[in-house]
C-alpha cells in the first residue's frame, strides 16, 4: 500500500464541543433541506478499496472539495452556524496541507472523482447533500486522522 | 469466507475479569474498525465501543470508559475486549462485529460468547 | 432505555406483508440500519443505509424512511422470516451506536 506521511490530526481538533455542535447543526439544518434521501455521498463507495492507513488521505481530498466548491459558493446559506463552521474546516483543511501518499493514489483519486461527479450531477440540490452531510465528513476525518 | 470467531462461554464470579477474543478470517483485518456489543434481556443491545485494528486506537460508550478495554493482535487478527470487576449485571452475550468507518453498519458479528457473572 | 422505539411484536400471515417501525428523535440526518436475529444466533444485517439491502438478502425485504420513523417492510412473508428484528442508528452527539429495543416477527 502507498505510504501516506504527515496525514494526522491532532485530537483535540474533535474535542471543542462548541464548534462540533455547530457542525452537526449546520449538517442537520441542511439535510432538512435535502429532499434526495437515496443518494449518499460519504459511505461505503466513498471508502472502497482504501485501506485504512491511506483513509486521511482520502477525506482531506474530500474536505478540499467541500470547501471550495461547496461550502465558499454557499456561504451565505445557514446562518450563522456556515459563517463559523467553514473557517474551522478550512484550519482542519490547511493542517492537512502537508499529507501525501508516496505511490500510486489513483483507486483514492477515482472514489474521490466519483463524489465530486455526483455532487456536480445533482446541481444545487448535490452541495446541499454535501452540507448536510457535514457530520459524516467530520467523524470521518476524526476516524481517518487523529 | 469472511468470518469473525469468537472465544467459549465463561462462568465468573462478581470481581473478577474476563477477556473475550475474536478472530477475523478471510479479509484486510487493518480495514475494518472491531465493535464490541452485548445483548441482555433487560437492556437489550448496548454498543461499548471500537477498536481501529491498523492504529489500536479505540472509542469507548461513555458507559464503558475507564472500566472496559479493548485491544487487537494483529499478528493473529485477533480483537480483545477485557471486562474487570464483573457484576451480575454483567450477564450477557458479547458480539464482536465489523464496520467499516466506525459509524457504519455492522455487516459481519462474531457469533456471540456468553459470559455468566454468578457467585 | 433504547431511544430508539420499536413495537414490541408484529404477527403476519404467511404471504402476507409485514411492517416494522422504528421511531426516534432528529433521525433526519442519521442512517437506519435493520438486523435480524433468529433464536440463538447472531444478528444478521438486512438493511443499511435506510433502503440498501446487503448482496444474499432477498428482495423482498426493503426500507425506506418518512421523517422520524424508520419502516423494514417484509413482503411475501415465509415461516422462515420469524425472527426478532433491531433498528440502529449512530448518533454523532453522544458519539455511539444505539439500538431499538426490538420487535419479535410472528409467522402465524
Known amino acids: 500500500a502507498p505510504i501516506s506521511s504527515h496525514c494526522r490530526l491532532d485530537k483535540s481538533n474533535f474535542q471543542q464541543p462548541y464548534i462540533t455542535n455547530r457542525t452537526f447543526m449546520l449538517a442537520k439544518e441542511a439535510s432538512l433541506a435535502d429532499n434526495n434521501t437515496d443518494v449518499r455521498l460519504i459511505g461505503e463507495k466513498l471508502f472502497h478499496g482504501v485501506s485504512m492507513s491511506e483513509r486521511c488521505y482520502l477525506m482531506k481530498q474530500v474536505l478540499n472539495f467541500t470547501l471550495e466548491e461547496v461550502l465558499f459558493p454557499q456561504s451565505d446559506r445557514f446562518q450563522p452556524y456556515m459563517q463559523e463552521v467553514v473557517p474551522f474546516l478550512a484550519r482542519l483543511s490547511n493542517r492537512l496541507s502537508t499529507c501525501h501518499i508516496e505511490g500510486d493514489d489513483l483507486h483514492i483519486q477515482r472514489n474521490v472523482q466519483k463524489l465530486k461527479d455526483t455532487v456536480k450531477k445533482l446541481g444545487e440540490s448535490g452541495e446541499i447533500k454535501a452540507i448536510g452531510e457535514l457530520d459524516l465528513l467530520f467523524m470521518s476525518l476524526r476516524n481517518a486522522c487523529i | 469466507e469472511v468470518q469473525l470467531v469468537q472465544s467459549g462461554a465463561e462462568v465468573k464470579k462478581p470481581g473478577a475479569s474476563v477477556k473475550v477474543s475474536c478472530q477475523a478470517s478471510?479479509?484486510?483485518?487493518?480495514?475494518?474498525?472491531i465493535h464490541w456489543v452485548r445483548q441482555t434481556p433487560g437492556q437489550g443491545f448496548e454498543w461499548m465501543g471500537w477498536?481501529?485494528?491498523?492504529?489500536?486506537?479505540?472509542r469507548y460508550a461513555q458507559k464503558f470508559q475507564g472500566w472496559v478495554t479493548m485491544t487487537r493482535d494483529m499478528s493473529n487478527t485477533t480483537a480483545y475486549m477485557e471486562l474487570p470487576r464483573l457484576r451480575d449485571d454483567d450477564t450477557a452475550v458479547y458480539y464482536c462485529?465489523?464496520?467499516?468507518?466506525?459509524?457504519?453498519?455492522?455487516?459481519?458479528w462474531g457469533q456471540g460468547t456468553l459470559v455468566t457473572v454468578s457467585s | 432505555q433504547s431511544v430508539l422505539t420499536q413495537p414490541p411484536s408484529v404477527s403476519v400471515a404467511p404471504g402476507k406483508t409485514a411492517t416494522i417501525t422504528c421511531g426516534g428523535n432528529?433521525?433526519?440526518?442519521?442512517?437506519v440500519h435493520w438486523y435480524q436475529q433468529r433464536p440463538g444466533q447472531a444478528p444478521v444485517l438486512v438493511i443499511y443505509y435506510d433502503s440498501d439491502r446487503p448482496s444474499g438478502i432477498p428482495e423482498r425485504f426493503s426500507g425506506s424512511r418518512s421523517g422520524n420513523t424508520a419502516t423494514l417492510t417484509i413482503s411475501r412473508v415465509e415461516a422462515g422470516d420469524e425472527a426478532d428484528f433491531y433498528c440502529q442508528v449512530w448518533d454523532f452527539l453522544t458519539d455511539s451506536g444505539s439500538f431499538g429495543g426490538g420487535t419479535k416477527l410472528t409467522v402465524l
Open positions: 432528529n433521525f433526519r440526518n442519521k442512517r
Open positions: 462485529a465489523r464496520d467499516l468507518t466506525g459509524f457504519d453498519p455492522f455487516d459481519i
Open positions: 477498536v481501529n485494528p491498523d492504529t489500536g486506537g479505540t
Open positions: 478471510g479479509y484486510t483485518f487493518s480495514d475494518y474498525y
